[in-house]
Interface confidence: low
């Protein structure tokens, strides 16, 4: 379920309508408040790096910028979920990690970020224009995915450059626009709240947003200025894709699965030394996808010996659009 971010543009009212639309004073603060609240919508970042020492070796780092509990992370290549990707690794905070060649080492870096080292030869070798995708399933936000790849001109040993690419996809431009609108809106809302209720109506009003966008999503400006943006779902050189990709709907996961159904709704358990989420200074950040969980509060997996909770008879809820290969 792809929802393109729509920019709720703020436009001046038509001349002469100000008196007839005094109700804007009441409506606008709530609209802006809604926008401010959704400014906390989670995002996923992806950083792809080719190692200088081994030209066929890649490091993929992904992180989740959200407040929810991560229940599953799926890393795939060749495209996102349901779009031709094949799962490389699935990381479950309690159940552990699954990885498939050419993935060599997948691990949790922090409570909300992971890294994957990839190497291979022949048909299963990654190559510079391969797209890598990370999907985070979290509760209650749902599933969020981003994809990235090395820019064609990247030198070994370097990740994507810190400057934005000149051409943005429409949804990324929309995300960036939303960030600006939200920033403006939040400041403006504070301004409105300080005014007396009987002051004249504001001269700005939001236009109707597209019905396709149930909510606008923000993309952190700090990342926008640092991350390199690449057009996702780029055509992949088939010689660089796994041999299994001639399937009808290949990809990964968890499934696998670029997505895996899961019920987990818990705070990840892992190394005590997990640090706070790093925001990469450079990387490939691409489109975000969200599929909300159909039900809340579903059971976690095993938490220790002797404790097993059986699944809801309906089974684990699938991450929509989803593993995986989880």
């Amino acid at each position: 379920m792809r929802t393109e971010a729509q920019v709720p543009a703020l436009q001046p009212p038509e001349p002469g309508l100000e008196g007839a639309m005094g109700h804007r004073t009441l409506v606008l603060p709530w609209v802006l408040l809604t926008l401010c609240v959704t400014a906390g919508t989670p995002e996923v970042w992806v950083q792809v790096r080719m190692e200088a020492t081994e030209l066929s070796s890649f490091t993929i780092r992904c992180g989740f910028l959200g407040s929810g509990s991560i229940s599953l992370v799926t890393v795939s290549w060749g495209g996102p979920n349901g779009a031709g990707g094949t799962t490389l690794a699935v990381l479950h905070p309690e159940r552990g990690i699954r990885q498939w060649a050419p993935a060599r080492q997948a691990r949790w870096e922090t409570q909300s970020s992971i890294s994957l080292i990839l190497e291979g030869s022949g048909a299963s070798s990654p190559c510079a224009n391969t797209t890598f995708c990370c999907k985070f399933a979290s509760f209650p936000e749902g599933s969020w995915e981003a994809c990235g790849s090395l820019p064609p001109s990247s030198d070994p040993g370097l990740s994507a450059p810190p400057t934005p690419a000149p051409i943005l996809r429409a949804d990324l431009a929309g995300i960036l626009g939303v960030s600006g609108v939200l920033l403006f809106g939040c400041v403006y809302l504070l301004h409105l709240l300080r005014r007396h209720k009987h002051r004249p109506a504001p001269r700005l009003q939001p236009s109707r947003t597209s019905p396709q966008a149930p909510r606008a999503r923000a993309w952190a400006p700090s990342q926008a200025s640092q991350a390199a943006l690449h057009v996702p779902y780029a055509t992949i050189n088939t010689s660089c894709r796994p041999a299994t990709l001639d399937t009808a709907h290949p990809h990964g996961g968890p499934s696998w699965w670029a997505s895996l159904p899961t019920h987990a709704a818990h705070r990840p358990q892992g190394p005590a030394a997990w640090a706070s989420t790093p925001i990469p200074a450079r990387g490939s950040f691409v489109s975000v996808e969200n599929g909300l969980y159909a039900q809340a509060g579903e059971r976690p997996p095993h938490t220790g010996p002797g404790l097993t909770l059986f699944p809801d008879p309906r089974g684990p809820r699938a991450m929509e659009g989803p593993l995986g290969v989880r």
Epitope: G253, W257, A258, L260, P300, G315, P316
Partner: antibody, heavy 119, light 106 residues
Framework: EVQLQQSGPELVKPGSSVKISCEAS????????VDWVKQSHGKSLEWIGA????????SYNQKFEGKATLTVDKSSTTAYMELRSLTSEDSAVYYC????????????WGTGTTVTVSS | DIQMTQSPSSLSASLGGKVTITCKAS??????IAWYQHKPGKGPRLLIH???TLQPGIPSRFSGSGSGRDYSFSISNLEPEDIATYYC????????FGGGTKLEIK
């Protein structure tokens, strides 16, 4: 009742392909991955691969990459496995199984499909 | 890949008796082992998962234990319908089955 009903036995010639099916019933098809497992005569079980019915995502045991192709048809709640370039080594009983995602084991299995490769 | 060594490959026991099957993993599998009963012409039936957790509807005559690399599965008070081949499955790292144990009744 949760069931995985598999297609009937197949007798095929070396070098050809075969596509076997696994029809799921009694549960929400998209909520569980479907895995395939091979049992050669007199031998143990080997995991072949898995598919997520929700979006067709797949993963394979490296040993079976290029040999098996997994697909699904959500409308008929059926998973398929195509085996190509068949040899006598591929003669076996193939099972589909439902995979409990959070705990990674297989809780419900199909009845099995016998594939015999013979000239 | 994790290897699972299951023993014995076959055994014979008397009705009402008890049998024990063992599986040894090539590395620690963190108790992520399941046991299946397999009868000819049918699909395997899950009996136990996570070392010792019985599936709903499975009689308590079936039990499992173990940790680290060593695991065991027992059937007590053997009944005729227990005649089958039993497999262990490690699911800590991908999936690997044991070689199977064929149980016969004396």
């Amino acid at each position: 009742e949760v069931q995985l009903q598999q297609s009937g036995p197949e007798l095929v010639k070396p070098g050809s392909s075969v596509k076997i099916s696994c029809e799921a019933s009694g549960y929400t098809f998209a909520d569980y991955n479907v895995d395939w497992v091979k049992q050669s005569h007199g031998k143990s079980l080997e995991w072949i691969g898995a598919i997520n019915p929700n979006d067709g995502g797949t993963s394979y045991n490296q040993k079976f990459e290029g040999k098996a192709t997994l697909t699904v048809d959500k409308s008929s709640t059926t998973a398929y496995m195509e085996l190509r370039s068949l040899t006598s080594e591929d003669s076996a009983v193939y099972y589909c199984a439902r995979w409990v995602i959070n705990d990674w084991y297989f809780d419900v299995w199909g009845t099995g499909t016998t594939v015999t490769v013979s000239s | 890949d994790i290897q699972m060594t299951q023993s014995p490959s076959s055994l014979s026991a008397s009705l009402g008796g008890k049998v024990t099957i063992t599986c040894k993993a090539s590395q620690d599998i963190n108790k992520y082992i399941a046991w299946y009963q397999h009868k000819p012409g049918k699909g395997p039936r899950l009996l136990i998962h996570y070392t010792s957790t019985l599936q709903p509807g499975i009689p308590s005559r079936f039990s499992g234990s173990g940790s680290g690399r060593d695991y065991s599965f027992s059937i007590s008070n053997l009944e005729p319908e227990d005649i089958a081949t039993y497999y262990c499955l490690q699911y800590d790292n991908l999936w690997t089955f044991g070689g199977g144990t064929k149980l016969e009744i004396k």
